[in-house]
Interface confidence: medium
Amino acid sequence: EVEKTACPSGKKAREIDESLIFYKKWELEACVDAALLATQMDRVNAIPFTYEQLDVLKHKLDELYPQGYPESVIQHLGYLFLKMSPEDIRKWNVTSLETLKALLEVNKGHEMSPQVATLIDRFVKGRGQLDKDTLDTLTAFYPGYLCSLSPEELSSVPPSSIWAVRPQDLDTCDPRQLDVLYPKARLAFQNMNGSEYFVKIQSFLGGAPTEDLKALSQQNVSMDLATFMKLRTDAVLPLTVAEVQKLLGPHVEGLKAEERHRPVRDWILRQRQDDLDTLGLGLQGGIPNGYLVLDLSMQEALS
């Protein structure tokens, strides 16, 4: 807390300019009017205030706006945003995408700080849903943003927003998140033709059910092994050798290198060995000839 002291004669600030950097902390407190600061916030960022001086400026704004800063001030916070706590930000009502962009720019190139996470949360809650423009902005600054959301939060993403998602935005998503995103992507891209559809849907396929994988196998998509390895194990297990061969096309040879890893390992265990042998890849571990295969999961479903 800065002590309240009278402003020395002739030092009262008429505007926010470079001369203020030579003011001591108590002089800034005493000589800079908070309302003047609020109206000239856009100048603060251009002036090389020290961290200590920024603390004083923040204190003045906090006193002027105890219930939270107005958006006109928030938009021009610049580096002063780094001084804000999540508690400060929870008082804000940020509705403009331009304000959001301006503040994200301050944190650009770095991991999401608690301040940024709180800011985004406030913004998205204020909008009611994660619309396309917001998602565009957030994933541009934070490619991993989508994957930081819970499945519940992802459920508020409208299918139209999925167009903004790039493959790298899904790199860190887990299966539960892809389970939510995949149906939205399927809906969003439903009017595209086969090859274009596959290009768009590919990075979401970690959430695809068996029937959709079966359908894709009929479309000569030539799925690469990296995508195949990210598929849900439970979705891959029911696929036949012929369906996997069609799904992967020329990439089927890659199964050999992945035979010890899920989902390939588990899928091999479910196939007849003589069916696997038809691939000519030397895959081992299938069900020997003459053995009866009981699908217990099917039996349970029937009973």
Epitope: A46, P48, L82
Partner: antibody
Framework: EVQLVESGGGLVQPGGSLRLSCAAS????????MSWVRQAPGKGLEWIGE????????VYTPSLKDKFIISRDNAKNTLYLQMNSLRAEDTALYYC?????????????????WGAGTTVTVSS | DVVMTQSPAFLSVTPGEKVTMTCSAS?????MYWHQQKPDQAPKLLIY???NLASGVPVRFSGSGSGTDFTFTISRMEAEDAATYYC?????????FGGGTKVEIK
């Protein structure tokens, strides 16, 4: 290699002028605040002033404000110090220095790269 | 201006010896910075934010302190450490430097 090389120093008569240059290399000059610092013989280091990346903000130590002019040319990766009305007490080794950039891009409170300096002697 | 007072002004030490110097600020500062200058060379940043080692600086150098009193230490003096060491603050404008501590090898 990150480097700053000053030039333009020399002998000048009292009342005369001189322009020092500082050539930057090995880093994105256009992203950094740059400073001039001087050291008179047998004295300590004295900060002269600084300039922001796009030249929109220039700050001088109050006692030198009307006598020195700092400028930069980002296209040439060069910082300048125009010195006018020189006096004997301006005799010093003049350094250019880069102001460190904080993790978030905000300028820090230290000089992380220095030049070796150029000597200015004011004498009749 | 914040006046920085460094002491001692001069130190003569033997290799392997511990070296300690202090810097006192006329008013409280948040951080201290330390620079090394060898004859006819550019100054070099050693310590930033009071105690953090700048990139490539050997771990025998360290810094500590708070408020107005700060310390710079070389745990085991080496011949190549012979230089003048300056403290610096930038908690308020203008940034100011100490007068320097010259360290020589005995």
């Amino acid at each position: 290699e990150v480097q700053l090389v000053e030039s333009g120093g020399g002998l000048v008569q009292p009342g005369g002028s001189l322009r020092l240059s500082c050539a930057a290399s090995g880093f994105d000059f256009s992203r950094y605040w740059m400073s001039w610092v001087r050291q008179a013989p047998g004295k300590g280091l004295e900060w002269i002033g600084e300039i922001n990346p796009d030249s929109s903000t220039i700050v001088y130590t109050p006692s030198l404000k009307d006598k020195f002019i700092i400028s930069r040319d980002n296209a040439k990766n060069t910082l300048y110090l125009q010195m006018n009305s020189l006096r004997a007490e301006d005799t010093a080794l003049y350094y250019c220095a880069r102001r460190g950039s904080h993790y978030y891009g905000y300028r820090t409170g230290y000089f992380d790269v220095w030049g070796a300096g150029t000597t200015v002697t004011v004498s009749s | 201006d914040v006046v920085m007072t460094q002491s001692p002004a001069f130190l003569s030490v033997t290799p392997g010896e511990k070296v300690t110097m202090t810097c006192s600020a006329s008013s409280s500062v948040s951080y201290m910075y330390w620079h090394q200058q060898k004859p006819d060379q550019a100054p070099k940043l050693l310590i930033y934010d009071t105690s953090n080692l700048a990139s490539g600086v050997p771990v025998r150098f360290s810094g500590s302190g708070s408020g107005t009193d700060f310390t710079f230490t070389i745990s085991r003096m080496e011949a190549e450490d012979a230089a003048t060491y300056y403290c610096q603050q930038w908690s308020s404008y203008p940034p100011t430097f100490g007068g320097g501590t010259k360290v020589e090898i005995k």
